[in-house]
Interface confidence: low
Amino acid sequence: DTHKSEVAHRFKDLGEEHFKGLVLVAFSQYLQQCPFEEHVKLVNEVTEFAKTCVADESAENCDKSLHTLFGDKLCTVATLRETYGEMADCCAKQEPERNECFLQHKDDNPNLPPLVRPEVDVMCTAFHDNEATFLKKYLYEVARRHPYFYAPELLFFAARYKAAFAECCQAADKAACLLPKLDELRDEGKASSAKQRLKCASLQKFGDRAFKAWAVARLSQKFPKAEFAEVSKLVTDLTKVHTECCHGDLLECADDRADLAKYMCENQDSISSKLKECCDKPLLEKSHCLAEVENDEMPADLPSLAADYVESKDVCKNYAEAKDVFLGMFLYEYARRHPDYSVMLLLRLAKAYEATLEKCCAAADPHECYAKVFDEFQPLVEEPQNLVKQNCELFEQLGEYKFQNALLVRYTKKVPQVSTPTLVEVSRNLGKVGAKCCKLPEAKRMPCAEDYLSVVLNRLCVLHEKTPVSEKVTKCCTESLVNRRPCFSALELDEAYVPKAFNAETFTFHADMCTLSEKEKQVKKQTALVELVKHKPKATKEQLKGVMDNFAAFVEKCCKADDKEACFAEEGPKFVAASQAALA
């Protein structure tokens, strides 16, 4: 399916609006520090060029690859060396090395100010004054902060963002209409970004075999009535889509995602009975809907797995003939029967099954050797079941904030070398698993909890890879994708860690504490808690609780005082001294 001009092909397939949006996202994800106006200028130049190629595919440079065209355009940025340092060296390379170089310089934690939400009236005025610029600014600000955001999905978020303003800026109470919608988009956006980051990490760090295994398990749970061949086709197509998006090939990715949605809607009968309501929607909404679709009902008459995978005398023959296909079929069959298992658990079971066959098919009596393979699965299944049960009980007992604090203490003791902001961010997100999953029925708890934890722990791995400080974290992050969560769960107090020297500055607070939002206050307190644990890793729960209760009382007292700053100056050192004494 070759085209004389790739850029013309994609422009025609996607249409001008989506083409421009995706190019803006691509450029913003690569050059995260560039000002908005610079990116808009580059996008307009690329778009004008694409239009000349649509008019005449044989025109000069129209035959160049998209990487060449986009890379050449990025390398025209005058301040590349001053703004990005060594990333400018990418421009001396030829494709495909140049694009690889740009990808390697994507920054998961860019030094950008947090987005401040202006007053509703200010936003509505900006929206009405120039809707196109307003929406481009949204794409730009999200893309530069989330360099792996799933680009076609970001277009869907932008469409929802536009719809929210179009509706609410005309409402009687604009704020009451708009703010909950923006909060929802923000939270969903962060979740979407983190989920996509795990997909990209899976592809980039563990290869497409790892991603395909994940996709087989997840799609088999979603579409248990589909044949293995159908699931395999969807997995192949989905892998291509995500490989492209994770590789910065956003136009190809969006185009292929649209093709996949079209295929699924044309073949609903052989995939799932749940697709119907998605397929009536417009493209962006349709693709989103298909990605989030609920699991179809399991066929009633599924036979036992043991016949084909344990009792059969042909197991080793079938395995030897096509290992990956045989294991893929095993994973498919197991997953479609177990929507109650997390994808990561299903992948561990497939891995255990593979290890057993590797060992047993070389033994004197293979059948005797692998006859009890399903019994070996029991501890693997019970471990996440018990973990979810214990943590949901703890969450219900403590509530979200204190549950987060328990996790902060737990993880700081495991990996005290990790930076405090990272420990706070990751532990707060780990703690959100309670509200997200513990209210669900038993059959949905494990897939919700463990697969969410995998996403959050991937964030820890991604941040740690940028600045490696802990061999334990490196080990858990690199050894096995499917065993990351059990690896972190199994970590104990780091006995080799030399406690951090006490720094009174870390525990010095000011009157500005009082004007912070509830969330910001929590983050301040949790930051202090992590620093306490780094100072006294062997402190007991009771000691830490005592100090944190005193801290809350001290802040509350000073925020009620007439001279708040004087109170903090006077009471602060007393709190520090009392805390040191309590932890001695």
Partner: nanobody, 115 residues
Framework: EVQLVESGGGLVQPGGSLRLSCAAS????????MSWVRQAPGKGPEWVSA????????RYAESVKGRFTISRDNAKKTLYLQMNSLKPEDTAVYYC????????GSQGTQVTVSS
């Protein structure tokens, strides 16, 4: 499990050369940047050199620039450090590490430069 096994160290005269190797297993070697770190007697670990996952981007500490060359063979899952024009102050235990960390987790290989 992640394993890094260094070899190639030894006793060499000033001005001489050595080639260190680090055999990796238990992780997707080709996906990670790697570094060499050294620790002289009585001193803390010192980062020496780093290489990106594909082998295109290499970095060196000022003290070894122009004398040491880092390289890798992803097919063999092996990291190398070619050390030329060795000086007595290069005497140390050399470790390979994942990422650009100055911490050490393997056994290391002793390099002694002395006449």
């Amino acid at each position: 499990e992640v394993q890094l096994v260094e070899s190639g160290g030894g006793l060499v005269q000033p001005g001489g050369s050595l080639r260190l190797s680090c055999a990796a297993s238990g992780f997707t070697f080709g996906s990670f940047g790697m570094s060499w770190v050294r620790q002289a007697p009585g001193k803390g670990p010192e980062w020496v050199s780093a290489i990106d996952s594909g082998g295109a981007d290499t970095r060196y500490a000022e003290s070894v620039k122009g004398r040491f060359t880092i390289s890798r063979d992803n097919a063999k899952k092996t990291l190398y450090l070619q050390m030329n024009s060795l000086k007595p102050e290069d005497t140390a235990v050399y470790y390979c590490t994942i990422g650009r960390s100055a911490s050490r987790g393997s056994q290391g290989t002793q390099v002694t430069v002395s006449s």
